[in-house]
């Protein structure tokens, strides 16, 4: 069964800067990745970035740099201040559209016990199936 993992890290040097890493553990070919915050995309969440392997990348503030790390994982750097700044309990979600598995989404946030600069382990988060 495919899985999606989400890792959230707050940068020690910039407390309003977050790095989100997401990956897809499956055998299919990824056709689109959507990163959102505040909940799943389409369920109250706000899109931060969309990554298409053959057309490119689109991002919205406070996203600063979205990029593919591997064929099946991405990273997103967020920078914010004031109202657009993420906070420690913000939920980030990644949705992977893949053939033939369909769409798989997982969400994660910074663990309450995390010190700045420490990261949550990249374990698969609860998975939402969204066909």
């Amino acid at each position: 069964t495919p899985e999606v993992w989400v890792q959230v890290r707050m940068e020690a040097t910039e407390l309003s800067s977050f790095t989100i890493r997401c990956g897809f553990l499956g055998s299919g070919s990824i056709s689109l990745v959507t990163v959102s915050w505040g909940g799943p995309n389409g369920a109250g969440g706000t899109t931060l970035a969309v990554l298409h392997p053959e057309r490119g990348i689109r991002q919205w503030a406070p996203a600063r740099q979205a990029r593919w790390e591997t064929q099946s994982s991405i990273s997103l750097i967020l920078e914010g201040s004031g109202a657009s700044s993420p906070c420690a309990n913000t939920t980030f979600c990644c949705k992977f559209a893949s053939f033939p598995e369909g769409s798989w989404e997982a969400c994660g946030s910074l663990p309450p016990s995390s010190d700045p600069g420490l990261s949550a382990p990249p374990t698969p988060a609860p998975i939402l199936r969204a066909d």
Partner: nanobody, 118 residues
């Protein structure tokens, strides 16, 4: 399918300047990396310079002091400013785009001829 259209090639004397431009048909997504390669007669195609959508630049040492690359204000445009041109810069210059930065799908322009006469 992303289309790349180049312009700005031509004939120039040694020591002169040229500016090459390339525009992509993709207007919704940012292409992660765009760049320029060149192919001289009888030689392999070689990298000249690349730039990511966030502004990270790579320029080969042989042209680093003479060429600059930039992304335009319009989405997915890239320019190569070439100065102090030398006869050995004569080549067909190709615009290149890699939307993901992973090489999964790479697009090429048709090429524009640059000829530097001595």
């Amino acid at each position: 399918q992303v289309q790349l259209v180049e312009s700005g090639g031509g004939l120039v004397q040694a020591g002169g300047s040229l500016r090459l431009s390339c525009a992509a048909s993709e207007t919704y997504f940012d292409l992660y990396v765009m760049g320029w390669y060149r192919q001289a007669p009888g030689k392999d195609r070689e990298l000249v310079a690349t730039i990511t959508y966030t502004g990270s630049i790579k320029i080969v040492d042989s042209v680093k002091d003479r060429f600059t690359i930039s992304r335009g204000d319009a989405k997915n445009t890239v320019s190569l400013q070439m100065s102090s041109l030398k006869p050995e810069d004569t080549a067909v210059y190709f615009c290149n785009a890699d939307p993901s930065g992973l090489g999964r799908k790479v697009y090429w322009g048709q090429g524009t001829q640059v000829t530097v006469s001595s």
